[in-house]
């Protein structure tokens, strides 16, 4: 007989990822001797907690826990027994509750103490269910790329850990109420809410990062709607064919389009609007949702929001990938430069319904908001955050990297349970299990 | 008030075209709306047929698509369907129905449900020889 | 395409007391945190009647008594107090993907 070395114990972490429209789980492992390293941490299973976000329940705080449970019986099967007391589990919420909180604080209390009495139940060492704010999502967000592609630090042949010299990623990331932009720069920001410092493994990072609310895919969408409601009569980026009926109340009921509520309107009223297949139209309706007009710094983005010309290469995940890769894969189209993807997003908002539907056949929910999704798009990086074409090249649209989501969970994660040391890792020899 | 009549032969002979208009009255079909015939089997369920849509597009469910074809004629404010070399196993009440889709907002996410809200009362069509 | 099993196919219940249909898909009718279910009410001789969609909203001018709930591929139509008025065929509908399917219905009968 001879004696075997066992492999290391693994340890585990969960996030809930409370989005403005659903909540995802993720659950984190990584082995227990090996904390410090880099890109040891990856993802172990995954969950989609079925319904809406928990923004949706503020009339049903409670159904907002309930709608977790699935996901957490899930958990307790993922995570091994012995490792149940021991695994942190995390619920962060973003956009939609950010906007909750805005107009009814009491019900964003009320849902996240709802969410937190049911975490409470489970034998988890549960650490908290709050808002983040949109700094914490950028960062986290470019946190959880960078350590994936371990563009921090790298273990060398030569037996010791090394700084890569392809320095870090920018990440975009595109939610549902919000988008994200954060990149590291050489030079202080102007303004000093749009800049964080950070100290990773010794390494010091000044990193500029911005949140805009209400530019998310799905609350562009709605803002959209309230412009087509208020200036045409019918929609410019929906297809030719395409009818329906809106309730008013459903439009305007969001903080995102109170600024195009009308004075005195029907919430009650039903409304019908039809789509029109016109690219330019809806290209001008796009357009007014950014203000170019003044800038209190030296350069700003859009809005008045000041922002250092984009550097370096970038990864832009959630929606922003879906969209890009609805027009790659469904529609077969190339999107390699900024031309083409405004070549793509009018080809798709040229599409008739019935074209759209044989083109795309089966899904039909969504269908129709591609073509404004895409010009958003489209528009957003090239107008907005001021990319051109060389520095389009730089950009990569990814949902996944190391079979891990790229997402704000896993930075989320890392910072709160100190997986990433401020202080450079020391010499070590490593132990080989095989 | 929207409201739907279907019409047409009763029986219709194997192999033969089954044939039925449906009137709308209260609203123009160019307007909009999608305008649909389904049918439903001797004590069965329900099965969509296909729509033209008030843009005159189709959509048919592909179980049926070779052999379904629906028309408008818009002077009248009528909608038809034809159906093509017929069997017994289409005998079934036919409805004509008005949809469309429908704007719900849930967790500030806007989506489209395509909902059936206006039906005729239906016509029964026998095939048999 | 989406098939949709209903359960149970007759359900006797007298009234004021509760009703539950369910209905069962065979993949997921929801997508983005939405879910694609409508449920129609269908009375001897009469066509089918809008009664709930997206799962839980209850179409204008129906009784409050009529709820839904559900997503993925479980949903269900509850009556929490039955009238004799309510004797009819109950079917569920998808509209997630085409083509747009139907449940084989449930009968609810009054005792």
């Known amino acids: 007989t001879r004696d075997v070395r066992e492999p290391p114990a693994l340890k585990y972490g969960i996030v809930l990822d409370a989005g403005s429209s659903h909540t995802s789980m993720f659950i984190y492992k990584w082995p227990a001797d090996k904390e410090n390293d880099t890109g040891i941490v990856g993802q172990h299973s995954s969950c989609d907690v079925p319904g809406g976000g928990i923004s949706s329940y503020a009339d049903n705080p409670s159904g907002a826990s309930q709608s977790l449970v699935g996901c957490l019986e899930q958990a307790l099967q993922d995570v091994p027994k012995e490792r149940h007391a021991g695994t942190p589990l995390y619920l962060g919420a973003t956009a939609g509750m950010r906007l909750l909180n805005l107009t009814n604080p009491e019900a964003s209390t009320s849902v996240l103490m709802a969410v937190t009495h049911t975490l409470t139940q489970y034998p988890f060492d549960f650490r908290g269910a709050r808002i983040l704010s949109g700094q914490e999502e950028g960062v986290f967000g470019w946190v959880t790329a960078n350590y994936l592609l371990e563009n921090f630090i790298k273990y060398g042949w030569v037996g010791r850990w090394f700084r890569p010299r392809k320095g870090t990623l920018g990440a975009m990331d595109l939610g549902g109420a919000s988008t994200q932009i954060t990149f590291e720069t050489t030079s202080p920001a102007e303004d000093r809410a749009s800049e964080v410092q950070l100290h990773l493994y010794g390494q010091h990072y000044r990193v500029y990062t911005h949140s805009f609310l209400c530019y998310g895919r799905d609350q562009v969408l709605q803002r959209l709607l309230a412009s087509a409601l208020q200036t045409h009569g019918f929609h410019p980026c929906w297809p030719r064919g395409f009818s329906t009926q809106v309730l008013l109340g459903d439009v305007y009921q969001s903080p995102c389009t109170m600024a195009q509520r009308p004075q005195n309107f029907n919430s009650s009223a039903r409304v019908s609007l039809s789509g029109s297949s016109d690219p330019h139209l809806c290209r001008d309706l796009v357009s007014g949702l950014f203000s170019f007009s003044s800038c209190p710094f030296s350069r700003c983005s859009f809005n008045g929001v000041f922002q250092p010309p984009v550097a370096g290469n970038f990864v832009a995940f959630s929606a922003f990938f879906y969209t890009v890769d609805f027009l790659r894969t469904s529609m077969g189209l190339p999107v390699a430069t900024l031309q083409q993807l405004e070549a793509a997003a009018v080809n798709v908002c040229n599409q008739t319904w019935a074209q759209l539907q044989a083109r795309v056949p089966g899904q039909r929910a969504r269908l129709a908001d591609y073509c404004a999704g895409a010009m958003f798009v489209q528009q957003l990086l090239s107008r907005g955050y001021g990319f051109d074409e060389r520095a389009f090249g730089g950009v990569i649209f990814q949902k996944k990297a190391a079979d891990t989501a790229v997402g704000w969970a896993l930075g989320y994660m890392l910072n709160l349970t100190n997986l990433i040391p401020a202080d450079p890792p020391g010499l070590r020899k490593g132990t080989d299990f095989s | 008030q929207i409201q739907l009549q279907e019409s047409g032969p009763g029986l219709v002979k194997p192999s033969q075209t089954l044939s039925l208009t449906c009137t709308v009255s209260?609203?123009?079909?160019?307007?909009?709306?999608?305008w649909n015939w389904i049918r439903q089997h001797p004590g069965k369920g329900l099965e969509w047929i296909g729509y033209i849509s008030y843009d005159a597009d189709n959509n048919y469910n592909p179980s049926l698509k070779n052999r379904v074809t629906i028309s408008r004629d818009t002077s009248k404010n009528q909608f038809s369907l034809k159906l093509s070399s017929v069997t017994a196993a289409d005998t079934a009440v036919y409805y004509c129905?008005?949809?469309?889709?429908?704007?719900?907002?849930?967790?500030?996410?806007?989506?489209?449900?395509?909902?059936?809200?206006?039906w005729g009362q239906g016509t029964t069509v026998t095939v048999s020889s | 395409e989406t098939v949709l099993t209903q359960s149970p196919a007759t359900l006797s219940v007298s009234p004021g007391e509760r009703a539950t249909i369910s209905c069962k898909a065979s993949q997921s009718v929801d997508y983005e945190g939405h879910s694609y279910m409508n449920w129609y009410q269908q009375k001897p001789g009469q066509a089918p009647r809008l009664l709930i969609y997206a799962a839980s909203n209850l179409e204008s001018g129906i009784p409050a008594r009529f709820s839904g709930s559900g997503s993925g591929t479980d949903f269900t139509l509850t009556i929490s107090s039955v009238e004799p008025e309510d004797a009819a065929t109950y079917y569920c509908?998808?509209?997630?993907?085409?083509?747009?399917?139907f449940g084989g219905g449930t009968k609810l009968e009054i005792k």
């Open positions: 209260g609203y123009s079909i160019t307007s909009g709306y999608y």
């Open positions: 129905a008005g949809g469309y889709y429908r704007y719900g907002l849930g967790s500030y996410r806007g989506s489209y449900y395509y909902v059936m809200d206006y």
């Open positions: 509908q998808q509209s997630n993907e085409d083509p747009p399917t």
